[in-house]
């Protein structure tokens, strides 16, 4: 398939509430009308899909209702937010962008964003 450049930050630290946000930017070679954005997680040699959304240019991203991802789009930039992360979810999160319509089909894969998640320490019970 035709290749397309996708850029994303190298490292992101999740908040104490387990939320991580990063920007995925793609160099669109043409006038895409429908774009599919997928977040992949690479652990060891396994690559799995975390979430995916399709959007018409100029409209908002629509993730499934039960998705752990939300996002907004602006031109060739997608602002992605992943929620509900735990320390065990620390890993490389890859942004994949597919230009679905009009033809030809383009696919771009980012180098991945290493998301670090630290579980908050439980608050000690205090006796007053």
């Amino acid at each position: 398939c035709k290749a397309m450049h996708v850029a994303q930050p190298a490292v992101v630290l999740a908040s104490s509430r387990g939320i991580a946000s990063f920007v995925c930017e793609y160099a669109s070679p043409g006038k895409a009308t429908e774009v599919r954005v997928t977040v992949l997680r690479q652990a060891d040699s396994q690559v799995t899909e975390v979430c995916a959304a399709t959007y018409m240019m100029g409209n908002e991203l629509t993730f499934l209702d039960d998705s752990i991802c939300t996002g907004t789009s602006s031109g060739n930039q997608v602002n992605l937010t992943i929620q509900g992360l735990r320390a065990m979810d620390t890993g490389l999160y890859i942004c994949k962008v597919e230009l679905m319509y009009p033809p030809p089909y383009y696919l771009g894969i980012g180098n991945g964003t290493q998301i670090y998640v630290i579980d908050p320490e439980p608050c000690p019970d205090s006796d007053f």
Partner: antibody, heavy 123, light 108 residues
């Protein structure tokens, strides 16, 4: 083992319609993009249409756009091709073919093929 | 659309000989090219994908090479069952997926 079995071919008059089916077994149908590829008598291969693994996207050759519709039912492991406004030049053996959707590189090549069903458009 | 041109149209060789089939693309397809074999009355079969990788169950006598616009399918020592029509196909710029017009490999 993998099996793709086409059905629904036959002789039809120009301007009429026909619906082809392709029953799949032996692989995870819902992980594969599915194609129709045709071959006119004594000629080479011509790609006709593609439907995404989950049915969300469809693509067509210019020669059939607006006349043919590809669809699938993943619960039945079946692929369809609705052919309307048929023309003499649509006469061919129609093959269904699977193409694995690779998560990193997109739709793959035609790895499994059916034996084909012959569609003859003639008055 | 990308046009694939195969040569020669017909290749006449004897069993045991080496066969070299060519496929040229009208623009670069990187390494996104496959080769298929089709015998009379049968469906095509995937032989080589991404220019040089043998598909499952394909004998080692089949090999592919090339990138960009020029590709080659080589059969190192022809067996009787290798006589068939061979097609190249690209998945670089689609739709449409395009095939070459085919090379018929016949017994001399």
């Amino acid at each position: 083992q993998v099996q793709l079995v086409e059905s629904g071919g036959g002789v039809v008059q120009p301007g009429r319609s026909l619906r082809l089916s392709c029953a799949a077994s032996g692989f995870t149908f819902s992980s594969y993009g599915m194609h129709w590829v045709r071959q006119a008598p004594g000629k080479g291969l011509e790609w006709v249409a593609l439907i995404w693994y989950d049915g969300s996207y469809t693509y067509y050759a210019d020669s059939v756009k607006g006349r043919f519709t590809i669809s699938r039912d993943n619960s039945k492991n079946t692929l369809y091709l609705q052919m309307n406004s048929l023309r003499a030049e649509d006469t061919a053996v129609y093959y269904c073919a699977s193409a694995y959707y690779d998560i990193l590189t997109g739709p793959y090549y035609f790895d499994y093929w059916g034996q084909g069903t012959l569609v003859t458009v003639s008055s | 659309e990308i046009v694939l041109t195969q040569s020669p149209a017909t290749l006449s060789l004897s069993p045991g000989e080496r066969a070299t089939l060519s496929c040229r693309a009208s623009q670069s397809v990187s390494s996104y090219l496959a080769w298929y074999q089709q015998k009379p009355g049968q469906a095509p079969r995937l032989l080589i994908y991404d220019a040089s990788n043998r598909a499952t169950g394909i004998p080692a006598r089949f090999s592919g090479s090339g990138s960009g616009t020029d590709f080659t399918l080589t059969i190192s020592s022809l067996e009787p069952e290798d006589f068939a029509v061979y097609y190249c196909q690209q998945r670089s710029n689609w739709p449409p997926y395009t095939f070459g017009q085919g090379t018929k490999l016949e017994i001399k």
